[in-house]
């Protein structure tokens, strides 16, 4: 008799990334019988949810659902039938929602609750939505690229570091050299695979690259003479209105907010890198440090460790701009932002038609960000950058705190080694 | 402003095929999803399938699968609906169209092309 | 298939007034918790327009004038005050399931 292939077996999980500027949902498969191995998990789908991040609802929470089928039903059609009820299905908030935490409770709420309702509507194994913390989101990105990199399971090898940004914050994650960790909020230990980790990680609340623009503006326009603002950070030629309104809507710039003599105002670009870079730097505070050292707005960052990942718009960003190559030192990326944020706006719309107007003209900004961000804010140098290595995907799987996440809430990252290898069950009988 | 702009009319003879495209601009064609729609003469709306550019996945109302291919090319932003074997039952106004959120705000909208015509004769 | 059907097949209704357009699925259209009924109107020579989306939200810059209702199988599209601008054939969709299908039309006449 001919030899008959048994059923996979295998199982699913659902995370749903529900970040500042839009929604993306990630389906992860494994085999059942290799639960606790290092690296078995792999992602097969994502679908980017087509609309903003949830937390632009607010107003229209009783449409949430409408919003979220897309991708469930993209998530029924890939998993099959037979296990819809027993994968998991989670949904994390990162920034954007605890910004909006911070202005209303209450309104926070109301989405999460709309969102948990519409979840369970589904045929699976709805967990649960919740915003998580800044701490468990570089926490869990940290564990995700290592994990997928298979730093876990490689005797005394070294981990890398996580640098993640997104629309609201950005966080940043690493073993320190054998140094102690000043700031408690700061530590976290791990205990993976039967190895102890001594984990540094910070998430920066309003500077993610589309809170930090708003911060940038708010803080430009105060000083401004008329309803005209000239911005080194948009090309020449650039010019956009902004609503008063709109740039106070956004607790990151409560700080800068004043009552001003208009309540519109026209950017006028100017593209200019080196004014840009200086504009951006009066974001950090680096006047004041209670400890041995520090990021910014007094915030401690032990002295910078080994190999980094940076992914997220980290990523998306430098990877538009063609600088991801670990080739490109930082002196030239900074001569390549240079010529680029120089390059008239006319120009720009032509070479890259299909994008997004919006987002094109925000390009300059958010390179030059990364830059100061890296440089300035996290100390890494001309000679430490090659350190950084700017990654979309790791195998397949997209850089991110998702898979972290759903490996921690499904009990897959043991905290010791196991003692053996499951015998894999063989493909044919 | 997001736009549609089809290519123009099209006489094809039957046993032919064609290729309609749907040039995007205003917004990234893989934040949303694009929808082809047939149109007879006098007739009503008939819908083709949906393309999903981001990832190239589709859905077809079946009696269109083997008569439309449905593709879409990110890097110059359009979207293409191929149709072989032609007859005159395939003569029609074809639109590509997009309906859903914007991608900043929680607005609802949607965008047509114009149309393009296609005859099929002899 | 969902087969959907629109009565009248044609109306005419004085300006100011209550225009009242029905569609009836042969099945639910409803799923999740939503209601998968969306209506477009077409004039002469354009493409269709959306009106109305999950059967009772309005789409973006659509007048106040349009709203939409129901669940299920029955749904209605009713504008009120009729203006000289909705004249125009009307068209409900469903998207619950592929094939996702059109309702047949209801020519709308200023009488």
């Known amino acids: 008799t001919q030899n008959k292939a048994l059923p996979e077996n295998v199982k699913y999980g659902i995370v749903l990334d529900a970040g500042s500027s839009h929604t993306s949902l990630y389906i992860y498969k494994w085999p059942a019988e290799k639960e606790n191995d290092t690296g078995v998990v792999h992602q097969v789908e994502e679908c980017r949810v087509k609309g903003p991040g949830i937390s632009k609802f607010v107003q229209k929470v009783n449409e949430i659902g409408i919003y979220l089928t897309d991708c469930m039903e993209r998530a029924r059609e890939v998993i099959p039938r037979s296990q819809h009820q027993e994968t998991p299905v989670y949904l994390g908030a990162t920034a954007g929602m605890r910004l909006l935490r911070m202005e209303s409770e209450e309104l926070a709420d109301r989405v999460l609750d709309v969102v948990e309702r519409s979840l369970s509507n589904y045929p699976f194994d709805f967990q649960g939505a919740r915003i998580i913390t800044g701490q468990e989101e570089g926490a869990y990105g940290w564990i995700t690229i290592n994990y997928l990199l298979g730093r876990f399971k490689t005797p005394g090898g070294s981990t890398f570091g996580a640098l993640d940004l997104g629309g609201a914050s950005t966080q940043v994650t690493f073993v320190p050299q054998n140094q102690t960790i000043e700031s408690p909020d700061n530590a976290l230990q791990f205990r993976l695979y039967g190895k102890d980790y001594n984990v540094y990680t910070h998430s920066f609340l309003c500077y993610g690259k589309d809170q930090a623009l708003w911060q940038k503006l708010a803080k430009d326009i105060q000083v401004a003479s008329n309803e005209i603002l000239r911005d080194p950070c948009f090309h020449p030629g650039y010019k956009k209105v902004v609503n008063v309104s709109d740039l106070y809507k956004t607790p990151c710039t409560k700080r800068f907010e004043m009552t001003l003599p208009f309540q519109q105002f026209e950017i006028q670009g100017i593209g200019n890198y080196q004014q840009c870079h200086q504009s951006i730097l009066e974001l950090f505070n680096t006047s004041y440090c209670p400890y041995s050292q520090c990021a910014f707005n007094g915030i401690f960052l032990p002295p910078l460790q080994g190999d980094f990942g940076a992914f997220s718009a980290f990523y998306f960003v430098m990877k538009f701009l063609n600088l991801t190559s670990e080739k490109v030192s930082q002196e030239k990326v900074t001569e390549m932002m240079k010529k680029f944020c120089a390059q008239p706006w006319e120009e720009i719309k032509t070479s890259y038609a299909g994008v997004k107007e919006k987002y094109l003209s925000e390009y300059c900004f958010s390179g030059t960000y990364i830059l100061s961000l890296l440089l300035q804010g996290y100390h890494f140098t001309a000679d430490s950058w090659e350190h950084i290595h700017f990654i979309g995907k790791i195998q397949g799987s997209d850089a991110g705190w998702t898979l972290g996440y759903m490996l921690n809430l499904t009990n897959m990252i043991p905290a010791e080694q196991p003692l053996s290898t499951p015998l894999s069950h063989s493909t044919y009988v | 402003e997001v736009q549609l702009q089809q290519s123009g009319a099209e006489l094809v003879k039957p046993g032919a095929s064609v290729k309609l495209s749907c040039i995007v601009s205003?917004?990234?064609?893989?934040?949303?999803?694009i929808n082809w729609v047939k149109q007879r003469p006098e007739q009503g709306l008939e819908w083709i399938g949906r393309?999903?550019?981001?990832?190239?996945?589709?859905k077809y109302d079946p009696k269109f699968q083997g008569k439309a291919t449905m593709t879409s090319d990110t890097s110059s932003n359009t979207a293409y609906l191929h149709l072989s074997s032609l007859t005159s039952d395939d003569s029609a106004v074809y639109y590509c169209?997009?309906?859903?959120?914007?991608?900043?705000?929680?607005?609802?909208?949607?965008?047509w092309g114009q149309g393009t015509t296609l005859t099929v004769s002899s | 298939d969902i087969v959907l059907t629109q009565s009248p097949a044609s109306l005419a209704v004085s300006l100011g007034q209550r225009a009242t357009i029905s569609c009836r699925a042969s099945?639910?259209?409803?799923?999740?918790?939503?209601?998968?009924m969306n209506w477009f109107q077409q004039k002469p020579g354009q493409p269709p327009k959306l009106l109305i989306y999950?059967?009772?939200n309005q789409g973006s810059g659509v007048p106040a004038r349009f709203s939409g209702s129901g669940s299920g199988t029955d749904f209605s599209l009713n504008i009120l005050p009729m203006e000289e601008v909705d004249a125009a054939m009307y068209f409900c969709?469903?998207?619950?399931?592929?094939?996702?299908?059109f309702g047949g039309g209801t020519k709308l006449e200023i009488k």
């Open positions: 205003g917004f990234n064609i893989k934040d949303t999803y």
């Open positions: 099945e639910s259209v409803d799923n999740y918790g939503i209601s998968f």
């Open positions: 393309i999903d550019p981001a990832n190239g996945n589709t």
């Open positions: 999950a059967a009772s």
């Open positions: 969709h469903q998207s619950k399931e592929v094939p996702w299908t």
């Open positions: 169209a997009r309906w859903g959120y914007d991608d900043e705000e929680a607005d609802y909208f949607d965008s």
